[in-house]
Amino acid sequence: CKAMHVAQPAVVLASSRGIASFVCEYASPGKATEVRVTVLRQADSQVTEVCAATYMMGNELTFLDDSICTGTSSGNQVNLTIQGLRAMDTGLYICKVELMYPPPYYLGIGNGTQIYVIDPEPCPDSDF
């Protein structure tokens, strides 16, 4: 297993609709054809897997149908979008990149993107 540098923004504020997008850029030492991207969430000292996708270079990322993540790839960067976020989902979202094929296997873990989610104010009751 060889180490690889992964860069991602330090902080992002989700939209009022609970959508957050961020880039995950990796310094690929070789010509990988198969890449796996995993998003991990760290909060309250707990780390959980949010979503993961394996893709072939030049193809779209494919997450599971029920995943809250979508993404696109371009060269050595992946643009990730997480939707359906609420204030309780605020936390550090860490991008993990694995170059699966061809060998050697490379692993890179970013410092994480702190995503803040602010629930919208409830609309005041109207008389209509």
């Epitope: 330090a10 902080v11 504020l13 989700a14 939209s15 309250d44 204030a87 605020t90 702190q114 602010i118």
Partner: antibody, heavy 116, light 108 residues
Framework: QVQLVQSGAEVKKPGASVKVSCKAS????????ISWVRQAPGQGLEWMGW????????NYVKKFQGRVTMTTDTSTNTAYMELRSLRSDDTAVYYC?????????WGQGTLVTVSS | EIVLTQSPATLSLSPGERATLSCGAS???????LAWYQQKPGLAPRLLIY???SRATGIPDRFSGSGSGTDFTLTISRLEPEDFAMYYC?????????FGQGTKVEIK
């Protein structure tokens, strides 16, 4: 090294607007947030809000909503805070600061005096 | 809005003594997202502690943060002459993010 350099002191009349600038250097500007905090003479710190430079999303404290606008220009690594309809109790030092989890770097502050 | 109450308002101590500053929240602070700052007259504040207990870069280890939920503490194990200043806590676990009113640590 990380630096945030703010524009100079301003004197404004009640009802006017002020726009304070904050030029960042020494780090990847759009990877961090910029927050704005003010401090009235002899008083404590007051959070005004922040902007996520990466996507331009903002979060303003309710008391300033409709009166404040925070923006950034990523081509010049500069953040701006505009406060409108100034009142005498807006007299304060306004700080810009880099935000992630806590404010780790601060500008030197801009004194805004509102007086007729 | 989460209201932060700092106590005491003023702490009079001598160099070498231990300082204990408290910050109480009106409701639980999510993920212990609480920071402590030091401010000296005429200067911008300086981040000491974030996430309740993580020391910021370059901060001496005599500063430590602890607590969770609604009760947080900043401890200065041995006061140095340069530590006499104002101290503010700030929560960023619930919008709007708020500061406490501050504790002044003065020389006795």
């Amino acid at each position: 090294q990380v630096q945030l350099v703010q524009s100079g002191a301003e004197v404004k009349k009640p009802g006017a607007s002020v726009k304070v600038s904050c030029k960042a250097s020494g780090y990847t500007f759009n990877y961090y947030g910029i927050s704005w905090v003010r401090q009235a003479p002899g008083q404590g710190l007051e959070w005004m809000g922040w902007i996520s430079v990466y996507n331009g999303n903002t979060n303003y404290v309710k008391k300033f909503q409709g009166r404040v606008t925070m923006t950034t220009d990523t081509s010049t690594n500069t953040a701006y805070m505009e406060l409108r309809s100034l009142r005498s109790d807006d007299t304060a030092v306004y700080y810009c600061a880099r935000w992630v989890r806590g404010v780790d770097y601060w500008g030197q502050g801009t004194l805004v005096t509102v007086s007729s | 809005e989460i209201v932060l109450t700092q106590s005491p308002a003023t702490l009079s101590l001598s160099p070498g003594e231990r300082a204990t500053l408290s910050c109480g929240a009106s409701q639980s602070v999510s993920s212990n997202y609480l920071a402590w700052y030091q401010q000296k007259p005429g200067l911008a504040p300086r981040l000491l502690i974030y996430d309740a207990s993580s020391r910021a870069t370059g901060i001496p280890d005599r500063f430590s943060g602890s607590g969770s939920g609604t009760d947080f503490t900043l401890t200065i194990s041995r006061l140095e002459p340069e530590d006499f200043a104002m101290y503010y806590c700030q929560q960023y676990g619930g919008s709007p993010w708020t500061f406490g009113q501050g504790t002044k640590v003065e020389i006795k």
